[in-house]
Amino acid sequence: KSSNEATNITPKHNMKAFLDELKAENIKKFLYNFTQIPHLAGTEQNFQLAKQIQSQWKEFGLDSVELAHYDVLLSYPNKTHPNYISIINEDGNEIFNTSLFEPPPPGYENVSDIVPPFSAFSPQGMPEGDLVYVNYARTEDFFKLERDMKINCSGKIVIARYGKVFRGNKVKNAQLAGAKGVILYSDPADYFAPGVKSYPDGWNLPGGGVQRGNILNLNGAGDPLTPGYPANEYAYRRGIAEAVGLPSIPVHPIGYYDAQKLLEKMGGSAPPDSSWRGSLKVPYNVGPGFTGNFSTQKVKMHIHSTNEVTRIYNVIGTLRGAVEPDRYVILGGHRDSWVFGGIDPQSGAAVVHEIVRSFGTLKKEGWRPRRTILFASWDAEEFGLLGSTEWAEENSRLLQERGVAYINADSSIEGNYTLRVDCTPLMYSLVHNLTKELKSPDEGFEGKSLYESWTKKSPSPEFSGMPRISKLGSGNDFEVFFQRLGIASGRARYTKNWETNKFSGYPLYHSVYETYELVEKFYDPMFKYHLTVAQVRGGMVFELANSIVLPFDCRDYAVVLRKYADKIYSISMKHPQEMKTYSVSFDSLFSAVKNFTEIASKFSERLQDFDKSNPIVLRMMNDQLMFLERAFIDPLGLPDRPFYRHVIYAPSSHNKYAGESFPGIYDALFDIESKVDPSKAWGEVKRQIYVAAFTVQAAAETLSEVA
């Protein structure tokens, strides 16, 4: 059958019918339904929501909807022994204690099972000692402290402000610096936008608000006890001492009211420069320890959380493809939340729900997609991307052979200014073409396309007249699909104006104040931005599943490969003498990129000209496109990060949220001037250039004519 026969409706009409069926009012209704109680991973409430979603997806018309369960390591506070931090005097008396819970938002005072703020997977402990303020606890902050200011964090409790980088990286850096505990806090400089009221009167963080979150350094491993394999009924589990990525020192998060009580007494060194000062009325002294009258006082942490193997549930829905049922396009987002999940994740889950409903409506009218679409409601994302990773580990053989694309669907909004897209270069043209067909929801862009408002508000730094599209990093459920399995991936959401709002994320992220009312009152009262995100995510899935030729343009990969090669070469050229001494050459990489560019160009020409009515040739060309992302996977993985296998992109070793290009070379070059054995260090740079050049060349050859 031809594609059109199989789907019964002309392709153009299909897409329009699908998009027209998406309704803002439904997304609003779904968001309300998903946010009335907490849905913490591993709890009965989240299991019940999984079953509700399973039932509703069946009603919407999917062919099958199954629960996939795993028994993974999670972390919870002790209900009878709360976590807190004290200031103690010389007699050991607690003269100040941090809060035990956040002040509940209006209307939620009587909700039970609100988990108090905690750092998931913190070990137990009651360390006491002097405090050192370490700014954002980034790699460069510890360099400043240790190398420039000669401040030793060994045996100290460090206090770091949230923002800039993933919290797990902060904890890892503190551990490496010898700290014996970490206090994380939200500074108003990063989580309180000027001119906006705090919740419930606005979308800013109140002083009692606290950001929860895991502090793992999993590097893509999934469940810490079963790295590489699914945490199923017959799994062999590591002992806790061998678990992947667990922190070794106690960690606890606090709000800025409590932080002020700790920071106002700080003595020792003054902050090195203004970039170390936040917005509290405190000196931001680095320490160590308290000033003058308070010098005999210490800080003591009381952490009693426990790690527990707990059952989690993914919901997996299938809409079978009519022509290529063995080709999978996946739309997935998580369901578990820290508390109510008003933005994270339910603003995304509500959009997925409406996309499923729209696809189901078309299916009930006799339509089917060309390829199979899988829909996923992941569990335990907040605990380290566990649900998605375990499912991908269980289904890795199918996915690596059949996975066309993965579209992520966590929070639909983190602001209401413009679109934000991170994706593989293969999807650039798909995103551009789709957004040109969608209406902008933005004020002042009535009757204009989404592409136009997006490009105006978030222009590409390289190409004029085009919007910014960012690299994929991690910190979300696409990680296993892209970084481990090499399946083309993308994500889209509405974001803030990064120029005017320098705070990190959105202010109420992972706090009790992330409610339905936050979204409905302050971010998107008409749910028009949610609808736009639904159209982008749904439209991408539709095109990927239904277009006869996969909507991937390999020439865009060629362009970025050249850009990334130039960038990494520039970094290396900061050491011209060493490059000469150790005969470091990037010729092989540039040659491979040149070859890739030429072969990609020829492939694109063939793609225009081939006989699309020949199903064998069509399948062959589509397979070359599908497997191109796969070709960038190195089966051996990156050094010390075996589950990060993509040679072109990996999460930054210094910030899990950020993507790094040519990460193997980048990490080999990082801080190379401080390495004790320069010959060995530059040898590793050369090895990484070799791996990258080989991989790019090998990927190029997958696009060559097959015979």
Epitope: I95, L100, F101, E109, G208, Y257, K281
Partner: antibody
Framework: QVQLQESGGDVVQPGRSLRLSCAAS????????LHWVRQAPGRGLEWVTL????????YYADSVKGRFTISRDNSKNTLYLQMNSLRAEDTAVYYC???????????????WGQGTTVTVSS | SYELTQPPSVSVAPGQTARITCGGN??????VHWYQQKPGQAPVLVVY???DRPSGIPERFSGTNSGNTATLTISRAEAGDEADYYC???????????FGGGTKLTVLG
């Protein structure tokens, strides 16, 4: 509307005890720090004690430390002041007051009760 | 322990500007709050965090704070403004709330 209502004031002899209550309504009680402030006849305002919204911190004026105890029952929306070993100088109108935000330290008191009178006299 | 010093009394003609000061060591580094108390009534917050006004308080009430002095300014004074005014801070050295001694504002005439 937002209200605080003190009760329990009385005439007592020196050395005796008294418990004041402050019933709250119209706001999310468990989300705010609370104070007791007193005013002796013809005198200015004198801070007595505070409690944080979750009860984890309590601070007292030196003049009452060891004799007075502040507590709260968030399920009953009620603040308490247990006063032991009362002295003549504790004679005053006692006000309970709510802080403008959850933090009870650096921020102002935006809602006050009408006060309850405690007289310590033999 | 930390002390706040207020003038016992301030007089102002109707329609003129009254200024009530509150002195304290390096008070500019603290947040200052001001209360109005009329005879037989509970205090009312009129300015918080140095210069912010609660809803319902007229714009005529304003505050400043720097160095060793905080000031409550009442412009276009009215007879109804006649009351005792108290400044207040949190002293983090002693973990105490501190009130000033109070200033009696008289609106002449």
């Amino acid at each position: 509307q937002v209200q605080l209502q003190e009760s329990g004031g009385d005439v007592v002899q020196p050395g005796r005890s008294l418990r004041l209550s402050c019933a709250a309504s119209g706001f999310s009680f468990s989300g705010y720090g609370l104070h007791w402030v007193r005013q002796a006849p013809g005198r200015g305002l004198e801070w007595v004690t505070l409690i944080s919204y979750d009860g984890s911190n309590k601070y007292y004026a030196d003049s009452v430390k060891g004799r007075f105890t502040i507590s709260r029952d968030n399920s009953k929306n009620t603040l308490y002041l247990q006063m032991n070993s009362l002295r003549a100088e504790d004679t005053a109108v006692y006000y309970c007051a709510k802080t403008t935000v959850s933090d009870p330290y650096y921020y102002g008191m935006d809602v006050w009760g009408q006060g309850t009178t405690v007289t310590v006299s033999s | 322990s930390y002390e706040l010093t207020q003038p016992p009394s301030v007089s102002v003609a109707p329609g003129q500007t009254a200024r009530i000061t509150c002195g304290g060591n390096n008070i500019g580094s603290k947040s200052v709050h001001w209360y109005q108390q009329k005879p037989g009534q509970a205090p009312v917050l009129v300015v918080y965090d140095d210069s912010d006004r609660p809803s319902g308080i007229p714009e005529r009430f304003s505050g400043t704070n720097s160095g060793n002095t905080a000031t409550l300014t009442i412009s276009r004074a009215e007879a109804g403004d006649e009351a005792d005014y108290y400044c207040q801070v949190w002293d983090s050295s002693s973990d105490h709330v501190v009130f000033g001694g109070g200033t009696k504002l008289t609106v002449l005439g």
